[in-house]
């Protein structure tokens, strides 16, 4: 069904970061404008992105309510500057989108060294525990908040001096690494959500090296 | 449902080479860390090295660094173990396994390499 | 690079002995110890990860502990299909190192 002059949305696609959330779509509208519509599997559909022409979405306000929750997205198309009109059905043209469930699926951003410090033949590495737009009473929640102990690291690490690589796992945001005392060393973290399936990992943090100004040093 | 099938494994002479496949069915390998790990015959279990297939990032234990190279195809979803100046002492069944980052939860059947001349 | 003690290597027990299998790092591992049985021609399978949790469809029976350098895996009531040969595996950092093994034998 449908009016001559629109076309559905298609392609519709869940960018999520962090939390950070937006749907994008197609095609680009020629003569039409979209409204987005988001809501839980038992909840009311909430409008958004009124008769824009763009063809995205910013959806986080309405999943960091409950980033647990499954949501379900459409996209209505309206003939431009007739948003009244409707398909032949006495509904507007739309397309829903996959099922997204933010907890389960959005990506983990690009993590960061916070610092590290070296205390004679052992380094502590610091990941920073990035804030995200998840709330909770009123405050911002990091990360580690929103998952806990689902939440890992993967550290990489080698000798400024040597290609050979060792790596470590932590359930926290820190790390206790042996070092050889004198020695040089360049970091790499990854984040990882061990019981996913998909968007397990995130990528590499950028890679940060001892003698370089993050860190501090003692003997 | 997720298998893991390993292949290449044969009799080779010492000082040649030898390129082991996992091939990985029921999840794409890029979303995990993957492994390989030997036992020579009526011994232990030993770690060789890692691979996240995602980023080609690469660790072994020091003893086989140099020596075996572990890559992936992600297009085909195979995970690769490249071993040369194979020696005897390198007989033994190969295996690959996937790694959720808190156990190995998937290994292949394994597969024998013997080098012997 | 840690190594895995394990011990011992080999132990024999009637049906419904409660069998105790320990493995000591050469330091902190931060419970990143599993158990896995193996048996004759098959690839390992996971029983115990973390140290203390059961993996899925694993029998109750099978139990661990332990935290630091010192790990404990129990099985409560020996059965007859759990002849076969455990490891336990560190895999806080790399290199990762598999204990040498416990072959395990019914009288």
């Known amino acids: 069904s449908g009016t001559t002059n629109t076309v559905a949305a298609y392609n519709l696609t869940w960018k999520s970061t962090n939390f950070k959330t937006i749907l994008e779509w197609e095609p680009k509208p020629v003569n039409q404008v979209y409204t987005v519509q988001i809501s839980t599997k038992s909840g009311d559909w909430k409008s958004k992105c009124f008769y824009t022409t763009d063809t995205e979405c910013d959806l986080t306000d309405e999943i960091v309510k409950d980033v647990k929750q499954t949501y379900l997205a459409r996209v209505f198309s309206y003939p431009a500057g007739n948003v009244e009109s409707t398909g032949s059905a006495g509904e507007p043209l739309y397309e829903n989108s996959p099922e997204f469930t933010p907890y389960l699926e959005t990506n983990l951003g690009q993590p960061t060294i916070q610092s590290f410090e070296q205390v004679g033949t052992k380094v502590n590495v610091t990941v920073e525990d990035e804030r995200t737009l998840v709330r909770k009473n009123g405050t911002f929640l990091t990360l580690r908040q929103v998952f806990g102990n689902d939440l890992g690291y993967i550290l990489t690490y080698r000798k400024s001096s040597s290609s050979g690589k060792k790596t470590a796992k932590t359930n926290t945001n820190e790390f206790l690494i042996d070092v050889d005392k004198g020695e040089n060393y360049c970091f790499s973290v990854q984040a990882v959500i061990p019981s996913r399936t998909v968007n397990r990992k995130s990528t590499d943090s950028p890679v940060e090296c001892m003698g370089q100004e993050k860190g501090e040093f003692r003997e | 449902q997720v298998q893991l099938v390993e292949s290449g494994g044969g009799v080779v002479q010492p000082g040649r080479s030898l390129r082991l496949s996992c091939k990985a069915s029921?999840?794409?390998?890029?979303?995990?860390?993957m492994h390989w790990v030997r036992q020579a015959p009526g011994k232990g279990l030993e770690w060789i090295g890692l691979i996240d297939p995602e980023n080609g990032n690469t660790i072994y234990d020091p003893k086989f660094q140099g020596r075996f190279t572990i890559s992936a195809d992600n297009s085909k979803n195979t995970l690769f173990l490249q071993m040369d100046s194979l020696r005897p002492e390198d007989t033994a069944v190969y295996y690959c396994?996937?790694?959720?980052?808190?156990?190995?939860?998937?290994w292949g059947q394994g597969t024998p390499v013997t080098v012997s001349s | 690079d840690i190594q895995m003690t394990q011990s011992p290597s080999s132990l024999s027990a009637s049906v419904g002995d409660r069998v105790t299998i320990t493995c000591k790092a050469s330091q902190d591992i931060r419970k990143y110890l599993n158990w896995y049985q193996q048996k004759p021609g098959k690839a390992p399978k996971l029983l115990i990860y973390y140290a203390t949790s059961l993996a899925d469809g694993v029998p109750s029976r099978f139990s661990g502990s332990g935290s630091g350098t010192d790990y404990t895996f129990t099985i409560s009531s020996l059965q007859p299909e759990d002849i076969a040969t455990y490891y336990c595996?560190?895999?806080?950092?790399?290199?990762?190192?598999f204990g040498q093994g416990t072959k395990l034998e019914i009288t």
């Open positions: 595996l560190q895999h806080g950092e790399s290199p990762y190192t």
């Open positions: 396994a996937r790694d959720n980052s808190y156990y190995f939860d998937y």
């Open positions: 029921g999840f794409n390998i890029k979303d995990y860390y």
